[in-house]
């Protein structure tokens, strides 16, 4: 298939309860009516596969499998939250655009989002 | 009823071209991509390439790219294949085939399929 | 490319037998997988498609299921026409590639 430029922030911190939002921008060539989105995630050179979803342009986004992520459209962007991260799940998230309908099938990947996840700090305990 | 009929089986010498036709009748010809597969003697199948008959877009198997052209007739319901650069290992049956409607999300199928062309090509 | 695997590559059965046909995808195909039929001489039947979906048309005793990477065909009892080639294929990336096909023999 044909390349597509996609853009994503470079670095994200999650928040203390472990959520993470990015936004996924995709330079649309043509006028793509279905739309794949994958976040894959990068550490130690092993590249695994987070969520995917698929969309009709103008329609939310449908997460496949059990999904961590979720997420809207607009446009040509896509805005992505992953949530029960943890300090363990820091790493490069890469954004994945397919535009699979009509033809010409068109692919981008974006240069990743570094997330860091920091655990927080465990509550003293209280004497009341 | 929905038809795909294609040419009649052809054979070539190594070199040299060869375009398949697919006739489609019974459904709206612009609603469906095309798909063409083929199928080498006594093997499994193997998918070339895809072309939206309404928008003239297209996509190959990299492994088709420069030998495989697609095109479509709109005004003729007819889809095309042409092979250029044939080896003894082209010899195979191709197959048009469409794919899901219009614009349907999880509509991946192939559900109909032309009776397919063996191609030979020999020296 | 995403790399489809059949297993077995054929086996003989008897009619009124359970047959069960197994394709391992080389990365998650989200259920975007289908199911064909293919007998000697003829073009590929449209058996299941989103692996689990039957086609119009077609037998009850066929079903499919998986997630992921691992999708099975089941027949729950085979007929006399039954025997053929089976076949699955892919459309999560292009190419979508098939698996290399199962045979289904009479013992």
């Known amino acids: 298939c044909k390349a597509m430029h996609v853009a994503q922030p470079a670095v994200v911190l999650a928040s203390s309860r472990g959520i993470a939002s990015f936004v996924c921008e995709y330079a649309s060539p043509g006028k793509a009516t279905e739309v794949r989105v994958t976040v894959l995630r990068q550490a130690d050179s092993q590249v695994t596969e987070v969520c995917a979803a698929t969309y009709m342009m103008g329609n939310e986004l449908t997460f496949l499998d059990d999904s961590i992520c979720t997420g809207t459209s607009s446009g040509n962007q896509v805005n992505l939250t992953i949530q029960g991260l943890r300090a363990m799940d820091t790493g490069l998230y890469i954004c994945k655009v397919e535009l699979m309908y009509p033809p010409p099938y068109y692919l981008g990947i974006g240069n990743g989002t570094q997330i860091y996840v920091i655990d927080p700090e465990p509550c003293p305990d209280s004497d009341f | 009823q929905v038809q795909l009929v294609q040419s009649g089986a052809e054979v070539k010498k190594p070199g040299s071209s060869v375009k398949v036709s697919c006739k489609a009748s019974g459904y709206t010809f612009t609603d469906y991509e095309m798909h063409w597969v083929r199928q080498a003697p006594g093997q499994g199948l193997e998918w070339i390439g895809v072309?939206?008959?309404?928008?003239?877009?297209?996509t190959y198997n990299q492994k088709f790219k420069g030998r495989a052209t697609l095109t479509a007739d709109k005004s003729t319901s007819t889809a095309y294949m042409e092979l250029s650069s044939l080896r003894s290992e082209d010899t195979a049956v191709y197959y048009c085939?469409?794919?899901?409607?219009?614009?349907?999300?999880?509509?991946?199928?192939?559900?109909?399929w032309g009776q397919g062309t063996l191609v030979t090509v020999s020296s | 490319d995403i790399q489809m695997t059949q297993s077995p590559s054929s086996l003989s059965a008897s009619v009124g037998d359970r047959v069960t046909i197994t394709c391992r995808a080389s990365?998650?195909?989200?259920?975007?997988l289908a199911w064909y039929q293919q007998k000697p001489g003829k073009a590929p039947k449209l058996l299941v498609y989103?692996?689990?979906t039957l086609g119009d048309g077609v037998p009850s005793r066929f079903s499919g299921s998986g997630s992921g990477t691992d999708y099975t065909l089941t027949i729950s009892s085979l007929q006399p026409e039954d025997f053929a080639t089976y076949y699955c294929?892919?459309?999560?990336?292009?190419?979508?590639?098939f698996g290399g096909g199962t045979k289904v023999e009479i013992k």
């Open positions: 072309i939206d008959p309404e928008t003239g877009g297209i």
């Open positions: 085939t469409r794919r899901g409607a219009r614009a349907t999300v999880y509509n991946y199928v192939m559900d109909y």
């Open positions: 989103n692996a689990k």
């Open positions: 990365e998650n195909i989200h259920n975007y």
């Open positions: 294929q892919h459309f999560w990336s292009t190419p979508w590639t």
